[in-house]
Amino acid sequence: MSVTACQGLGFVVSLIGFAGIIAATCMDQWSTQDLYNNPVTAVFNYQGLWRSCVRESSGFTECRGYFTLLGLPAMLQAVRALMIVGIVLGVIGILVSIFALKCIRIGSMDDSAKAKMTLTSGILFIISGICAIIGVSVFANMLVTNFWMSTANMYSGMGGMGGMVQTVQTRYTFGAALFVGWVAGGLTLIGGVMMCIACRGLTPDDSNFKAVSYHASGQNVAYRPGGFKASTGFGSNTRNKKIYDGGARTEDDEQSHPTKYDYV
């Protein structure tokens, strides 16, 4: 696969994954009422990171936001934080990768800069995807723990109301948002890896300066007439450079390895 294709595909996959992370974070169905082996209620409960909802048989749906920070479980806060960090890193990753795309020409940016930016965006996407996967997995673990705890208490006399009256214990299971989050995190991660792989293809080998040596008559000085920066397509490097003592070489991709991440 060509560098451009790998980079482009990585960007698209990351973009889809990032959109999925946003969707999962906003979705209300992180946990949904478990209907298996339960008296069928005329009310369906489901919860998200930001609000809980109730859908009645009548079709009416009522959602209430969690208007407190202190009263919320620490795990829920942690999941929120992980998803938001994932989104923020994804946003930065997208902005960086747009400038890093080989098919987009911006100013006189050379391939070394693009390689640096591609690697940076790749790393950002990888971390973004990992944040989403961890966030969703933590929430899923929390659900599993609560599910078995409520199963143990299923029809205990102390089921919320006191006395020996049967109460319906509402158990929650995995909602659609969890699956969206896992897939989206995975896609973002894969896209990030692809960007990192593309970065390797963009990076030059600086021990390989290939040029053609022209011997002028009566002189023993080799000149390399103004070679182009091969892959950027912007302007020519018209400075004459003395040939190394290695005989005649052909110039192909003259680049330098990135030394630091100097993008803005």
Epitope: P39, V43, N45, S58, Q166, T167
Partner: antibody, heavy 118, light 113 residues
Framework: EVQLQQSGPELVKPGASVKMSCKAS????????MNWVKQKPGQGLEWIGY????????KYNERFKGKATLTSDKSSSTAFMEVSSLTSEDSAVYYC???????????WGQGTSVTVSS | DIVMTQSPSSLTVTVREKVTLSCKSS????????????LTWYQQKPGQPPKLLIY???TRESGVPDRFTGSGSGTDFTLTISSVQAEDLAVYYC?????????FGAGTKLELK
């Protein structure tokens, strides 16, 4: 104004079937679930089931499964209930009622009286 | 099925008297998701269909006089008429609308002394 207009009284023989209607007006028919309730003379209310006209999804009281069949017609904004294999136990007033917020029945039809007699 | 028990079965009252009707369910009608009780109260006058009074155990339907008040949670519910009027003489039903099948109480008949 929301109205539920039910079909007229029925006098039927045992073993026969009867199909009654409930025509809705004054609201979007497919936006609300339609319930059916039975009331025997001088007795209390008994929920039969409901139909969601939007997707024709139904929910029945187990006691009425096989006895009552709920259908709807979107084009005429009408809900139907067919009661089969009639016996004297089926002699009652049958109401249709719209399901509202809180799963409450906010608007009721005037009722269809069914008398099963030979 | 959930059993709804209403008491008393009939009640003789005088105009402007305060009346309390009771309804007990065999299972809690409280939904943990929104902390609402799925219990409904209806009023039925002779020869008429029932009329919705209260839903969510305590929310008064629009157009219902404020002398009607619903209260209670879980399994014990009450309908209070703060000052009975002649037009309030009817049968009052409570209904479980939380767990299928929806079940009604046997009703409380309000009669004039």
């Amino acid at each position: 104004e929301v109205q539920l207009q039910q079909s007229g009284p029925e006098l039927v023989k045992p073993g026969a079937s009867v199909k009654m209607s409930c025509k809705a007006s004054g609201y979007t028919f497919t936006n609300y679930v339609m319930n059916w309730v039975k009331q025997k003379p001088g007795q209390g209310l008994e929920w039969i089931g409901y139909i969601n006209p939007y997707n024709d999804g139904t929910k029945y009281n187990e006691r009425f499964k096989g006895k009552a069949t709920l259908t709807s017609d979107k084009s005429s904004s009408t809900a139907f209930m067919e009661v089969s294999s009639l016996t004297s136990e089926d002699s009652a007033v049958y109401y249709c009622a719209r399901l509202y917020r809180g799963n409450a029945m906010d608007y009721w039809g005037q009722g269809t009286s069914v008398t099963v007699s030979s | 099925d959930i059993v709804m028990t209403q008491s008393p079965s009939s009640l003789t009252v005088t105009v402007r008297e305060k009346v309390t009707l009771s309804c007990k369910s065999s299972q809690s009608l409280l939904n943990s998701g929104n902390q609402k009780n799925y219990l409904t109260w209806y009023q039925q006058k002779p020869g008429q269909p029932p009329k919705l009074l209260i839903y969510w155990a305590s929310t008064r339907e629009s157009g219902v006089p404020d002398r009607f008040t619903g209260s209670g949670s879980g399994t014990d519910f009450t309908l209070t008429i703060s000052s009975v009027q002649a037009e309030d003489l009817a049968v009052y039903y409570c209904q479980n609308v939380y767990i299928y099948p929806f079940t009604f109480g046997a009703g409380t008949k309000l009669e004039l002394k």
